[in-house]
């Protein structure tokens, strides 16, 4: 057998499909690892071989296309299954190879079952709607390539267990779910179970996501620092701990990146030489807005440290602010026997 | 100042339509959602209809679906309110709150009654 | 669609007195649930929000509590003017519903 580049396991490309459904899965080589198409090696006299492991097995076997109704069969650079069964689950190879190439990649394929509710152990992809806007949709996804366009199949969707019908503000529209003023109530997982017929058979597809209603960019800001503030004085003694928290919060902004940092006299704290510790917490509203806190630390603070500038600073897509605290020397409180009485003129 | 002057009311016919307005001030009415409370005489108070601040989004009671419209004008900050095939059931005074989804009706008009008989 | 229940539909209190009112839910609204003071030929102003936070301007007698679907508002020493109508409002699932209403009067 000559040398063949192997792509290994795939395991970025995790399978996931239901039990007793259909599923087509196209050879990840095509999508991810050649710079060429299917149809284009197809030409050039390249033969795309299917195998697969069977869980829990170590031998390559491989894929029965004889089977009743052509329960498996392969169209080009797809792997049909017209229905899936429980003991498909597996590692799959796709090779492309002729006289003088080979390229090859494995992927696991895990077919899953669902209760009638629609649970299952498939990682949901998550779909983020903002609070309050007008009409948003979202739409049945991965139903694609399996039935033409002549055949009209029939939608029927759910919020977790239950129909939608009646839903005051969410309104199904064949392959799309309307959501009009989203509410947090609104969030949840949503099914499409799309019917169709082929070949004197009828074919379900089961598509669930999670809807999550997150805050809206109309309503965003820039950061806001809580503290530190212009209230609040930290006065300290030499030789005593210096806590000082840095609070933002951040106004949920889609793919945006918030930062939270301190600078000491101008400087990050790890470009300067005190021994200086930051604790960091991370919470979320209901809307994914988030609120991040840095609480700078100085175990035994110098009169030096308490002459430095210490400032928060904070970034979103939305802008940068900065607030310094307000940080000072605690005046020691005088001793009566010495101080005071000098102060009334005793000798 | 938040200020909803509400406009339009009046007696109209079993089956007639009417149109209300509400004219919003002191703040930037483009970014509130807005609805149409009603309270017939003596009673409590009902949610009729709801638009997202873009006007995109509207809602409605199943009492009023089909015959009531809500729309809103960001460039004259005005809500509206068209009612068509008007029932004696519909009598009642007419209110426009603003609302967010965090804080609910925050801020009323003064009403516009709507008296149907014939 | 949910509704809202309130209790008791009046409520006789001397000025002084501390009032509770009661709204419950026919299922759960989390803490999307508000309270209104209407007066006679008024407007509805809001109180409460959230359950429990006081809007702005209200004065602190009045408070709110609960979650799910038990509320209740409390007004801690009525004055005068705290003799009104009261409503409490789900706003967790459209429709927003409103209760029926608790009348609070002079005893």
């Known amino acids: 057998s000559e040398r063949c580049d192997d792509w290994g396991l795939d395991t970025m490309r995790q399978i996931q499909v239901f039990e007793d459904e259909p599923a087509r899965i196209k050879c990840p080589l095509f999508e991810h690892f050649l710079k060429f198409n299917y149809s284009t090696a197809h030409s050039a006299g390249l033969t795309l071989i299917w195998y697969w492991t069977r869980q829990d097995r170590d031998l390559e076997e491989p894929i029965n296309f004889r089977l009743p109704e052509n329960r498996i069969s392969k169209e080009k650079d797809v792997l049909w299954f017209r229905p899936t069964l429980l003991n498909d689950t597996g590692n799959y190879t796709c090779m492309l190879r002729n006289t003088t190439y080979c390229s090859k990649v494995a992927f696991p394929l895990e077919v899953v079952q669902k209760d009638s509710c629609f649970n299952s152990p498939m990682k949901l992809p998550v779909h983020k709607l903002y609070i309050e806007y007008g009409i948003q949709r979202i739409t049945c996804p991965n139903v694609d390539g399996y039935f033409p366009s002549s055949v009209k199949p029939t939608i029927t969707w759910y919020m977790g267990c239950y129909k939608i019908q009646n839903f005051n503000n969410v309104i199904p529209e064949g392959m799309n779910l309307s959501f009009l003023i989203a509410l947090i109530s609104n969030n949840g997982n949503y099914t499409c179970v799309v019917t169709y017929p082929e070949n004197g058979r009828t074919f379900h597809l089961t598509r669930t996501l999670t809807v999550k209603v997150v805050g809206s960019p109309k309503n965003a800001v820039p950061p806001v620092i809580h503290s530190p503030n212009d209230h609040v004085v930290y006065e300290k003694e030499p030789g005593e701990e210096l806590l000082i928290p840095c609070t933002v919060y951040f106004s949920f902004l889609m793919d945006s990146r918030n930062e939270v940092w301190w600078t000491i006299d101008g400087k990050k704290p790890d470009d300067i030489t005190i021994d200086v510790t930051i604790n960091e917490s991370i919470s979320h509203s209901r809307t994914e807005d988030e609120t991040r806190t840095q609480i700078l630390s100085i175990k035994k603070v110098t009169s030096e440290d308490l002459k430095r500038s210490y400032v928060c600073h904070a970034r979103s897509a939305k802008g940068e602010v900065a607030k310094a605290a307000k940080v000072k020397q605690k005046v020691p409180a005088p001793r009566y026997t010495v101080e005071l009485a000098c102060g009334f003129g005793a000798t | 100042e938040v200020q909803l002057l509400e406009s339009g009311g009046g007696l109209v016919q079993p089956g007639g339509s009417l149109r209300l307005s509400c004219a919003a001030s002191g703040f930037t009415f483009s970014h509130y959602g807005m609805s149409w409370v009603r309270q017939a005489p003596g009673k409590g108070l009902e949610w009729v209809s709801a638009i997202s601040y873009d006007g995109e989004g509207t809602l409605y009671a199943d009492s009023v679906k089909g015959r009531f419209t809500i729309s809103r004008d960001n460039s004259k900050n005005t809500l509206y309110l068209q009612m068509n095939s008007l029932r004696a059931e519909d009598t009642a005074v007419y209110y426009c709150?603003?609302?967010?989804?965090?804080?609910?009706?925050?801020?009323w008009g003064q009403g516009t009654l709507v008296t149907v008989s014939s | 669609e949910i509704v809202m229940t309130q209790s008791p539909a009046t409520l006789s209190v001397s000025p002084g007195e501390r009032a509770t009112l009661s709204c419950r839910a026919s299922?759960?609204?989390?803490?999307?649930l508000a309270w209104y003071q209407q007066k006679p030929g008024q407007a509805p102003r809001l109180l409460i929000y959230?359950?429990?936070t006081r809007a702005t301007g209200i004065p602190a007698r009045f408070s709110g509590s609960g979650s799910g679907t038990e509320f209740t508002l409390t007004i801690s020493s009525l004055q005068s003017e705290d003799f009104a109508v009261y409503y409490c409002q789900q706003y967790n699932n459209w429709p927003w519903t409103f209760g029926q209403g608790t009348k609070v009067e002079i005893k």
């Open positions: 709150a603003r609302f967010r989804y965090y804080t609910a009706f925050d801020y």
């Open positions: 299922q759960s609204v989390s803490s999307n």
């Open positions: 959230g359950a429990s």
